[in-house]
């Protein structure tokens, strides 16, 4: 339960995180489990501990094994295990399964490939990206921060992608590579000017003072995965978050994909304990995407409770 697998290549940097978490001020001790030998904290060592992190700079095949981390908190010690395997570098181009990180899938509209584990390292842009050992070149490929963006993804873009970057530790540079598979979802999608299904334009919604009320803004944007699409509510032309009325909150509904393949979004506006002044506000349902913005306006009116007295 408190164990995590980590792997790397010989002569590359590898940084491993303790599976147990604590406060920044807690001490973390690391041990090599087979010998129960303490891992030093001095950075002059090739393998050293730095708080929650265990650093192999660089890693060697002989470093493989189970490492124990103990997070020392005021009331009890939390023990975790890092199962580390360091592999020899392959001479050929194939990346074996045991070196692969989780597969990601993308489509024509969404093709980000994140470089695995990069957040653990002290690196500077740009990243280098390779597919099947070939450096990626051309305007379709953009290395942005810690991920690769592929424009106009095609089925041929599926494959194994390797990111390569340099980790810097006290002025010394170490290479790191990480590989993951990318699959392409075949989606014949398109995008349209937003169509608001609800509410109707200039709809009057009846509400009861003192009760809760919900308004749903629902819009469709096309078919398949949409690159940019959003629905939101505004009060008197102001974003809900900026309006500053805690009784009125918006909440994202379910992303919907109907049987006809249309991609639709819902945003529910919840008004708790409706007050008189809420009837004076203008409620705008906004739907926007790359084509533009559509707005439907709703106003509230008082619903007189049914008189049950004879």
């Amino acid at each position: 339960k408190f164990s995590k697998q980590s792997w790397g290549l010989e002569n590359e940097a590898l940084i491993v995180r303790c599976p147990r978490q604590g406060k920044p001020s807690y001490t973390v001790d690391w041990y090599y489990s087979q010998t129960n030998k303490s891992i030093p904290t001095q950075e002059r060592n090739r393998v050293f501990a730095s708080g929650q992190l265990l650093k192999f700079l660089p890693a060697a095949v002989a470093d493989s094994g189970i490492y124990t981390c103990i997070v020392r908190s005021p009331t009890f010690n939390r023990t975790g295990y890092a199962n580390v395997t360091i592999y020899k570098k392959q001479s050929d181009c194939n990346v074996p399964d045991y070196l692969m990180y989780s597969t990601v899938s993308g489509s024509e509209k969404n093709s980000k490939i994140y470089c695995p584990t990069i957040d653990l390292y002290n690196w500077t842009a740009p990243l280098e990206w390779f597919k099947n050992c070939q450096a990626l070149q051309g305007s379709r490929y953009r290395a942005h921060k810690s991920f690769l963006v592929i424009d106009n993804v095609m089925t041929e873009d599926a494959g194994d992608y390797t990111c390569k970057f340099i980790h810097n530790e006290n002025g010394a540079n170490y290479s790191v590579t990480a590989t993951r598979s990318f699959t392409v979802k075949d989606e014949q999608g398109f995008s349209l000017f937003p169509v608001i299904g609800a509410p109707a334009q200039n709809e009057i919604k009846e509400v009861e003072i003192g009760k809760n009320a919900n308004l749903t803004c629902s819009a469709c944007f096309g078919k398949g995965t949409q690159f940019l699409a959003a629905v939101l509510w505004q009060l008197n032309g102001t974003k809900i978050t900026d309006f500053g009325e805690p009784r009125i909150q918006q909440e994202e509904g379910q992303n919907q994909s109907f049987s006809n393949g249309l991609a639709c979004l819902d945003m529910v506006l919840r008004i708790a304990d409706v007050k008189e002044e809420d009837l004076l506000l203008q409620y705008d349902c906004l739907a926007l995407n790359l084509h533009g913005l559509r707005r439907h306006t709703v106003r509230l009116s008082r619903k007189n409770p049914i008189d049950h007295h004879s």
Partner: antibody, heavy 116, light 113 residues
Framework: QVQLVQSGAEVKKPGASVKVSCKAS????????MNWVRQAPGQRLEWMGW????????TYGDNFKGRVTITRDTSASTAYMELSSLRSEDTAVYYC?????????WGQGTLVTVSS | DIQMTQSPSSLSASVGDRVTITCKSS????????????LAWYQQKPGKVPKLLIY???TRESGVPSRFSGSGSGTDFTLTISSLQPEDLATYYC?????????FGGGTKVEIK
């Protein structure tokens, strides 16, 4: 900059469940645990539990054991708190707060109203 | 569970006054392993989210004005506002940051005369 954005207000009936989300940005989600704290109207803050975001291990406060479930989705950098068998005294603002020496980062709060 | 008791529950002071709030814990919050006192102080303005002022009993969170200071060790702790300002109108909470369940004091409401 670090931001924790919570889901919107909820109105629930007694006996129902509520699930509140907390989306983190501006830092590496799995580097810090996430706490959940609630505050009933006019009352003190009350710690409900926390989750180790790296391995998904939750720890719950005794007052909530059996009723609360804290989970996380690392791919979405989001933590969730689900409270079941709601009663009127669960009406409160629910906050997520990032673990640290003290809670330096809080979500904006989610008002949960339990009313028949 | 560690009980946190704050006093006073409310106070009224003038702008420029020195304000002191005390907090007592039912068990020591000192961790001998690193000599840290795991106590935090928060400020909560009406209708707002709590804001961390002090952690480790005496370390001021970045961006917090220097008029706020924390002291104490073991079971007795103090939050001091050296010169009260109008924007300090709020409720102040201490918190056991030492062991589960993390517990909060009942709060001290500070009003401006």
């Amino acid at each position: 900059q670090v931001q924790l954005v919570q889901s919107g207000a909820e109105v629930k009936k007694p006996g129902a469940s509520v699930k509140v989300s907390c989306k983190a940005s501006g830092y590496t989600f799995i580097n810090y645990g996430m706490n959940w704290v609630r505050q009933a109207p006019g009352q003190r803050l009350e710690w409900m539990g926390w989750i180790n975001t790296y391995i998904g291990e939750p720890t719950y406060g005794d007052n909530f054991k059996g009723r609360v479930t804290i989970t996380r989705d690392t791919s979405a950098s989001t933590a969730y708190m689900e409270l079941s068998s709601l009663r009127s005294e669960d009406t409160a603002v629910y906050y997520c707060a990032r673990e640290g020496d003290g809670f330096a980062y809080w979500g904006q709060g989610t008002l949960v109203t339990v009313s028949s | 569970d560690i009980q946190m008791t704050q006093s006073p529950s409310s106070l009224s002071a003038s702008v420029g006054d020195r304000v002191t709030i005390t907090c007592k814990s039912s068990q020591s919050l000192l961790y001998s392993g690193n000599q840290n006192n795991y106590l935090a102080w928060y400020q909560q303005k009406p209708g707002k989210v709590p804001k961390l002022l002090i952690y480790g009993a005496s370390t001021r969170e970045s961006g917090v004005p220097s008029r706020f200071s924390g002291s104490g060790s073991g079971t007795d702790f103090t939050l001091t506002i050296s010169s009260l300002q109008p924007e300090d109108l709020a409720t102040y909470y201490c918190q056991n940051d030492h062991s589960y369940p993390y517990t909060f004091g009942g709060g001290t409401k500070v009003e401006i005369k």
